[in-house]
């Protein structure tokens, strides 16, 4: 059974991930972002189901494309370079889902824009956090 300290650590990591995803979304939605139209052409794949930490495998598999989209944006829209930002997110995702379990992600048939994709994972973080508190 998870201890209160491990639950607290998980909650903090999820909150960190949530803030990173929200920051990316805010940077993309910035009205001064001249690359938004092109960014919205990138196809992202959504999980069929995202209710547990193991489902973060589906997020991890989309972080490469996410980095490429962020490379399009002006760096001043974000506090960190895309490479560093994605690297930070990868570390958090890996700690949350674990590196040992090889979960096979199942994707929904419909693809999503980067905005829909980020909103989906923001909702996921908020949902898991709410069950921990």
């Amino acid at each position: 059974a998870p201890t209160s300290s491990s639950t607290k650590k998980t909650q903090l990591q999820l909150e960190h991930l949530l803030l990173d995803l929200q920051m990316i979304l805010n940077g993309i939605n910035n009205y001064k972002n001249p690359k938004l139209t092109r960014m919205l052409t990138f196809k992202f794949y959504m999980p069929k189901k995202a209710t547990e930490l193991k489902h973060l495998q589906c997020l991890e598999e989309e972080l490469g494309p996410l980095e490429e989209v962020l490379n399009l944006a002006q760096s001043k829209n974000f506090h960190l370079r895309p490479r560093d930002l994605i690297s930070n997110i990868r570390v958090i995702v890996l700690e949350l889902k674990g590196s040992e379990t090889t979960f096979m992600c199942e994707y929904a048939d419909e693809t999503a824009t980067i905005v829909e994709f980020l909103n989906r994972w923001i909702t996921f973080c908020q949902s898991i956090i709410s069950t921990l508190t």
Partner: antibody, heavy 123, light 107 residues
Framework: QVQLVQSGAEVKKPGATVKISCKVS????????MHWVRQAPGQGLEWIGR????????KYAENFKGRVTITADTSTDTAYMELSSLRSEDTAVYYC????????????????WGQGTLVTVSS | DIVLTQSPATLSLSPGERATLSCQAS??????LSWYQQKPGQAPRLLIY???SLASGIPARFSGSRSGTDFTLTISSLEPEDFAVYYC?????????FGQGTKLEIK
């Protein structure tokens, strides 16, 4: 179906510069990140770098920085790879290949390849 | 840079046999690995992407699996046209790196 057609074989002297082309047909080049990979005779594959033809942003492998320039001409749907200060170790087949995030997951990998261009560096 | 180590360097088998090719990453790369087949004088051909997904037009006898940083390409029953060189490639971070290749030859 997307096709990549590369320019013909080249023979160069050490110290010279070579410029190889890769023409995309079946789609517009701006839908793809154009990558270059090389293969020395009897050796494995080595990633050189890539360009986003939509905004000309590039990424290069550290080994090639300062010697390689990847460019793209969107009006002709053609990507170019220029390698300068050639030495005998640059003798290889050079391939262009693509990645895109606009279509299926499969095409996020090196799904389309040119036929290869043999560059021979010899005095 | 991430190093991919393929083994064995050469694999000698007969048609109909099962082939198991290995690729080990020097660090965690998730599922950001693909497999390519290359025949003499030809460009590489994508077989498997995202560690386990079969590329379009590739026969079902090819499959990919992963355990941590160890990746495996399996050919369930070798056909004569399968004898070639196989490379793994990581897309986790630039520079993208390839394994040194495994030559699958007829015994």
């Amino acid at each position: 179906q997307v096709q990549l057609v590369q320019s013909g074989a080249e023979v160069k002297k050490p110290g010279a510069t070579v410029k190889i082309s890769c023409k995309v047909s079946g789609d517009t080049i701006t839908a793809y990140y154009m990558h270059w990979v090389r293969q020395a005779p009897g050796q494995g594959l080595e990633w050189i770098g890539r360009i986003d033809p939509d905004d000309d942003s590039t990424k290069y492998a550290e080994n090639f920085k300062g010697r390689v320039t990847i460019t793209a001409d969107t009006s002709t749907d053609t990507a170019y790879m220029e390698l300068s200060s050639l030495r005998s170790e640059d003798t290889a087949v050079y391939y262009c290949t693509t990645i895109t995030f606009l279509y299926s997951r499969e095409l996020r990998w090196f799904a389309y390849w040119g036929q290869g261009t043999l560059v021979t560096v010899s005095s | 840079d991430i190093v991919l180590t393929q083994s064995p360097a050469t694999l000698s088998l007969s048609p109909g046999e099962r082939a198991t090719l290995s690729c080990q990453a020097s660090q965690y790369i998730g599922n950001y690995l693909s497999w390519y087949q290359q025949k003499p004088g030809q460009a590489p051909r994508l077989l498997i992407y995202q560690a386990t997904s079969l590329a379009s037009g590739i026969p079902a006898r090819f499959s990919g699996s992963r355990s941590g940083t160890d990746f495996t390409l399996t050919i369930s029953s070798l056909e004569p046209e399968d004898f070639a060189v196989y490379y793994c490639l990581q897309h986790y971070s630039t520079p993208y790196t390839f394994g040194q290749g495994t030559k699958l030859e007829i015994k």
